[in-house]
């Protein structure tokens, strides 16, 4: 796994341990939490994440209306169970044995039930709604200009492939970025948009998982983006399965 | 040379704690996690967590989170384990043991725990 | 937690005679599996890392092979000090986990 070989340090996670007992000698960076070995010159999967910080010593509108099958993390933070690559296992279970059925960025899509709750696969979040409110300014930012620095920056910062970002949306003071990716899409080296929605996302709260590196400094043009509100919807490829109609509303 | 000192022997009564220590020499003692081994009398190897001394995190396996801590003294490059409530079924030998490929190992600690 | 399972519990082989120690994991843990042999009343000591790499200071005669989940050690011409136990051990993720070990005995 690369690392930053001269100080054995991992650029793109902070959450880690890094020593240089990998193979051949070279530098290895272990997830806290986990203890998996994680790979520097990428994202860190969000599982990995979210169970290192569980063990941490914590006019027209053009605004995209959510589908009624959109989901909000209501549920906020638990230590979730990952996979050998990392990912989401389909069932998460608390320390009292109450389960539920997760997408693959962890968000709750069942009603809990008990351990013999049957969780068959990973339903795939493909489309993802990150919604923005910005502080207000003296003038609403150029759209297009607007549109190209969120592209840079997604590409740039978190090497998500352009084509996963599908659009940017702007009615003042409001910001909404659509990512999309089918399973079908997403080659083996690719960043999946769950990783990189959640990098953003903590970038916005000023809790960057870079190491070393300070909040989002995002600029249109020379003035600054300030963010007030996020608020993240996710739609997976099946609807999900709760037995009464829920509010998603965040 | 790398070299990890544990002392020979420890002798205890049922009920009560012990500390084991592990002094490390010949390599930086920050840069590599230390990890703890138990071995009882004929059977196979235990792992029962490490400490990174660089940031004094620590894991435990299930098993052994209300028996063991773990700490460290960089001052002196010494990895120490405290054991609590100490029964005849932690009668065994404990080894520290260096980085994530435990390739240097101490001697081991015979802990033996008798009335 | 990751399982390990060793095969066979004991080995009985004659001087000069190959041998392979087997090690099965619960789940795939890539090449991050790590060989150990103890001697009676010593320290274990590594023989092989990651799977393959050698170390420096072990005798030629070991090697290792393997990935995923299934891997072996080898040793091409057994010799009296051979003589011990062998464990293999995985370093994927916490908590790591041993073998339950192989014990080699010379007819």
């Known amino acids: 796994h690369t690392a930053a070989q001269d100080n054995c340090t991992c650029p793109t996670n902070k959450m880690t341990v890094c020593s240089p007992d990998g193979p051949g000698g070279r530098c290895q960076c272990r997830a806290l939490g986990s203890g998996m070995a994680v790979d520097c010159s990428t994202l860190t999967s969000k599982c990995l994440l979210l169970k290192a910080r569980m063990s941490a010593p914590k006019n027209a509108r053009t605004l995209v209306r959510p589908s009624e099958h959109a989901l909000v993390d209501n549920d906020g933070l638990y230590d979730p169970d990952c996979d050998p690559e990392g990912r989401f296992k389909a069932r998460q279970c608390n320390q009292t044995s109450v389960c539920w059925c997760v997408n693959s960025v962890g968000v709750r899509r069942t009603d809990k039930g008990d351990l013999s709750l049957r969780c068959d696969e990973v339903v795939r979040t493909h489309h993802i709604l990150i919604e923005l409110r910005h502080r207000p300014t003296d003038r609403a930012f150029n759209h297009s200009d607007l549109d190209s620095e969120l592209r840079r920056l997604f590409q740039e910062r978190y090497k998500l492939h352009p084509s996963f970002l599908s659009a940017v949306h702007y009615e003042e003071p409001t910001i909404q970025i659509e990512l999309r990716q089918n399973a079908s899409q997403k080659g083996l080296r690719d960043v999946d948009i769950a990783d990189a929605a959640y990098y953003f996302e903590r970038d916005i709260k000023g809790e960057s998982l870079f190491m070393g590196r300070r909040g989002l400094d995002v600029q249109v043009r020379g003035e600054p983006l300030h963010v007030e509100r996020t608020l993240i919807y996710y739609l997976d490829e099946k609807p999900p399965q709760f037995s009464m109609k829920r509010l998603t509303a965040g | 040379q790398v070299q990890l000192q544990q002392p020979g022997s420890e002798l205890v009564r049922p009920g009560a704690s012990v500390k084991l220590s592990c002094k490390a020499s010949g390599y930086t003692f920050t840069s590599y996690w230390m990890h703890w081994v138990k071995q009882r009398h004929g059977q196979g190897l235990e792992w029962i967590g490490n400490i990174y001394p660089g940031g004094g995190y620590t894991n435990y396996d299930e098993k052994f989170k209300s028996k063991g801590t773990l700490t460290v003294d960089t001052s002196s490059s010494t990895a120490y384990m405290h054991l609590s409530s100490l029964t005849s079924e932690d009668s065994a030998v404990y080894y520290c043991?260096?980085?994530?490929?435990?390739?240097?190992w101490g001697q081991g600690t015979t802990l033996t725990v008798s009335s | 937690d990751i399982l390990l399972t060793q095969s066979p519990a004991i080995l009985s082989v004659s001087p000069g005679e190959r041998v392979s120690f087997s090690c099965r994991a619960s789940q795939n843990i890539g090449t991050s599996i790590h060989w150990f042999q103890q001697r009676t009343n010593g320290s274990p000591r590594l023989l092989i890392k990651y799977a393959s790499e050698s170390i420096s200071g072990i005798p030629s005669r070991f090697s290792g092979s393997g990935s995923g989940t299934d891997f072996t050690l080898s040793i091409n011409s057994v010799e009296s000090e051979d003589i011990a136990d062998y464990y293999c051990q995985q370093s994927n993720s916490w908590p790591f986990t041993f073998g339950s070990g192989t014990k080699l005995e010379i007819k």
């Open positions: 043991t260096r980085s994530s490929v435990f390739d240097y």
